[in-house]
């Protein structure tokens, strides 16, 4: 807290300008009018105040707006945003995408801070859903943003917003998140032709069920091994050797290198060795000839 002292004669700030960088903290407190600061916030970002000076300016705004800053001030906070706490930000009502962009720009190149996370949360809640423009903006600044959301939060993403998602935005998503996103992607891209559809849906396939993988295997998609390895194990297990061969096309040879890893390992254990041998890859571990395969899960469902 800065002590209340009278402003020295001739030091009263008539405008927010660069000469204020020389003001001691108590001089800033005494000589800068909070209302003047609020109306000229756009200038603050261009002036190289020290962090301690920014603390004083923040304190002045806090006194002027105890219930939270208006958006006209928030939009021009610039570096002062780095001084805000999540508690400060929870008082704000941010509705403009331009304001959001301006503040994310300040934090650009850094990890998502608690302040930024709170800001995004306030913004998205205010909008009611993650619309395409918002998602576009957020993933541009934070490629991992989408995967930081819970499945419940992802359920509010409209299918139309999926067009904004890039493959790298999904890199850190887990299967539960992809389970939510995949049906939305399927809906979003449903009117595209085969090859274009596969290019778009590929990064979401970690949430695809068996029947969709079977359908893809009929379309000459040539799925790469990296994508195959991210598929749900329970979705891959029912696929036949012929279906996997069609699904992977020329990439089927890559199965040998992955035979010890899931889902390939578990899938091999479910196939007849005879069928695996038709691939000519030397895959081992399938069911020997003459053995009967009982699907216990089906048996349990019937009883």
């Amino acid at each position: 807290e800065v002590e209340k002292t009278a402003c020295p004669s001739g030091k009263k700030a008539r405008e927010i300008d660069e000469s204020l960088i020389f003001y001691k903290k108590w001089e800033l407190e005494a000589c800068v009018d909070a209302a003047l600061l609020a109306t000229q916030m756009d200038r603050v970002n261009a002036i190289p105040f020290t962090y301690e000076q920014l603390d004083v300016l923040k304190h002045k705004l806090d006194e002027l707006y105890p219930q939270g800053y208006p958006e006209s001030v928030i939009q021009h906070l610039g570096y002062l945003f780095l001084k805000m706490s999540p508690e400060d930000i929870r008082k704000w009502n941010v509705t403009s995408l331009e304001t959001l962009k301006a503040l994310l720009e300040v934090n650009k190149g850094h990890e998502m801070s608690p302040q930024v996370a709170t800001l995004i949360d306030r913004f998205v809640k205010g909008r009611g859903q993650l619309d395409k423009d918002t998602l576009d903006t957020l993933t541009a600044f934070y490629p991992g943003y989408l995967c930081s959301l819970s499945p419940e939060e992802l359920s509010s993403v409209p299918p139309s917003s999926i067009w904004a998602v890039r493959p790298q935005d999904l890199d850190t998503c887990d299967p539960r998140q992809l389970d939510v996103l995949y049906p939305k992607a399927r809906l979003a891209f449903q009117n595209m032709n085969g090859s274009e559809y596969f290019v778009k849906i590929q990064s979401f396939l970690g949430g695809a069920p068996t029947e969709d993988l079977k359908a893809l295997s009929q379309q000459n998609v040539s799925m790469d091994l990296a994508t195959f390895m991210k598929l749900r194990t329970d979705a891959v297990l029912p696929l036949t050797v012929a279906e996997v061969q069609k699904l992977l096309g020329p990439h089927v040879e890559g199965l040998k290198a992955e035979e010890r890893h899931r889902p390939v390992r578990d899938w091999i254990l479910r196939q007849r060795q005879d069928d695996l041998d038709t691939l000519g890859l030397g895959l081992q571990g399938g069911i020997p000839n003459g053995y009967l395969v009982l699907d216990l899960s089906m048996q349990e469902a019937l009883s």
């Epitope: 300008d17 660069e18 000469s19 960088i21 020389f22 003001y23 001691k24 903290k25 800033l28 190289p48 105040f49 020290t50 962090y51 301690e52 000076q53 920014l54 570096y79």
Partner: nanobody, 127 residues
Amino acid sequence: EVQVVESGGGLVQAGASLRLSCASSGRTISPIAMAWFRQAPGKERELVAGLTWTGRTYYSDSVKGRFTISRDNAKNTVYLQMDSLKFEDTAVYFCAAGDNPDRRGSSWSSSSVYEYWGQGTQVTVSS
């Protein structure tokens, strides 16, 4: 790397004038701030006058109206014109330049903010 060299100090009578010069070299753009500090025996170094990269000026209360800070961009030189000198102006005067990219320090009135310093020039005012 910025080099800063002061000149112009000396011994004068109270009421007289002096002009200090601060020549900087080693860079093509103006630092964020150039400032004149002074340090009297047994006292802390204090800001006398400051000049921003845009030409805005600042003066400490003790010299306001008597001292003028200015610069000549062509010569990369900052001046401190000192008029109506008083006995209490006696000190070593230092020129400082600062770029402060990480905004450390308390304010630009604090010597800790400046990266580049001259060796100082002695100003003695006799009464």
